[in-house]
């Protein structure tokens, strides 16, 4: 059963390591994959003393942990590298950090990407 699924055909692309990896630094990435597989967008970033440093953004292969996520939100508490994935075109354009502890109320730390 799949409810309200939004197909992902393209994602915002960014690579902080673009010179070494010989890729573009930024752009729009078309997402390719098998017909029977879902596609997602992702973003990964670091928080260096309160400053957001994007590591990568782009397409992500079919991954059940990305299903039904319309927004790109990291919910893990204090990760070393932040990661989120989502479904829908360019859904990784904005990403946020909402740590959700087991007992305490979630706090909101929205992130504005600055490639």
């Amino acid at each position: 059963a799949i409810l309200g699924r939004s197909e992902t055909q393209e994602c915002l692309f960014f690579n902080a390591n673009w010179e070494k990896d010989r890729t573009n630094q930024t752009g729009v990435e078309p997402c390719y994959g098998d017909k029977d597989k879902r596609r997602h967008c992702f973003a990964t970033w670091k928080n260096i003393s309160g400053s957001i440093e994007i590591v990568k953004q782009g397409c992500w292969l079919d991954d059940i942990n990305c299903y039904d996520r319309t927004d790109c939100v990291e919910k893990k508490d204090s990760p070393e590298v932040y990661f989120c994935c989502c479904e829908g075109n360019m859904c990784n354009e904005k990403f946020s950090y909402f740590p959700q502890m087991e007992v305490t109320q979630p706090t909101s730390n929205p992130v504005t990407p600055k490639p």
Epitope: D63, I64, Y67, D68
Partner: antibody, heavy 118, light 111 residues
Framework: EVQLLESGGGLVQPGGSLRLSCAAS????????MSWVRQAPGKGLEWVSS????????YYTDSVKGRFTVSRDNSRNTLYLQMNSLRAEDTAVYYC???????????WGQGTLVTVSS | QTVVTQEPSFSVSPGGTVTLTCGFN?????????PSWYQQTPGQAPRTLIY???TRSSGVPDRFSGSILGNKAALTITGAQADDESDYYC??????????FGGGTKLTVLG
């Protein structure tokens, strides 16, 4: 520490029903897809069912489709497997597993035994 | 119906190296199937060894490594130890929510 604790197993007659529960702690349950995996006595592991973070997408192995229903209650940090029209071949230890990015099972419960016999 | 195949059994001498493989009937295994490997000893829950083809799970010794060999996923154990004697399962993620387990390999450490 991540913990997954299954319950609800037991002896049931063919055609009967059981509801398994998996109580999760030590991680943000609502942020993880979850699965059920089973193991018949002396046999290998078999994936049974998976559910997405919201519960909006559910998946089943062919042999249980239409008989088993997976669900989750994110407010209670609990995963469920409703098993109806049980058959002898459903006899197995049922494990609850947390699914992480790259769609792998990163944590497992200790399992609960379901025996279908008359 | 996808069938994932593993060697039913394998033997290795203590200190030796063994490579277990994982293939399937519908073509070649690639990294896009996110191959993962699990170890299980009798009466215990499975333990995660390798995910995403070649990433070791936390706490797993570096004697265990994952790769793609030809058209199969592979788990290599170098410097095999007595307590490596277990059942080993691979899992392929077929996409669209579907996981498929291999039949498992029973590894015997001789001696």
């Amino acid at each position: 520490e991540v913990q997954l604790l299954e319950s609800g197993g037991g002896l049931v007659q063919p055609g009967g029903s059981l509801r398994l529960s998996c109580a999760a702690s030590g991680f943000t349950f609502r942020n993880s897809a979850m699965s059920w995996v089973r193991q018949a006595p002396g046999k290998g592991l078999e994936w049974v069912s998976s559910i997405s973070v919201t519960g909006g997408s559910t998946y089943y192995t062919d042999s249980v489709k239409g008989r088993f229903t997976v669900s989750r209650d994110n407010s209670r940090n609990t995963l469920y497997l409703q098993m109806n029209s049980l058959r002898a071949e459903d006899t197995a230890v049922y494990y609850c597993a947390k699914v992480y990015y790259y769609s792998f099972f990163d944590y497992w419960g200790q399992g609960t035994l379901v025996t279908v016999s008359s | 119906q996808t069938v994932v195949t593993q060697e039913p059994s394998f033997s290795v001498s203590p200190g030796g190296t063994v490579t277990l493989t994982c293939g399937f009937n519908s073509g070649s295994v690639s990294t896009s199937y996110y191959p993962s490997w699990y170890q299980q000893t009798p009466g215990q829950a499975p333990r995660t060894l390798i995910y995403n083809t070649n990433t070791r799970s936390s706490g797993v010794p570096d004697r265990f490594s994952g790769s793609i060999l030809g058209n199969k996923a592979a788990l290599t154990i170098t410097g095999a130890q007595a307590d490596d004697e277990s059942d080993y399962y691979c899992v392929l993620y077929m996409g669209s929510g579907i996981h498929v387990f291999g039949g498992g390999t029973k590894l015997t450490v001789l001696g």
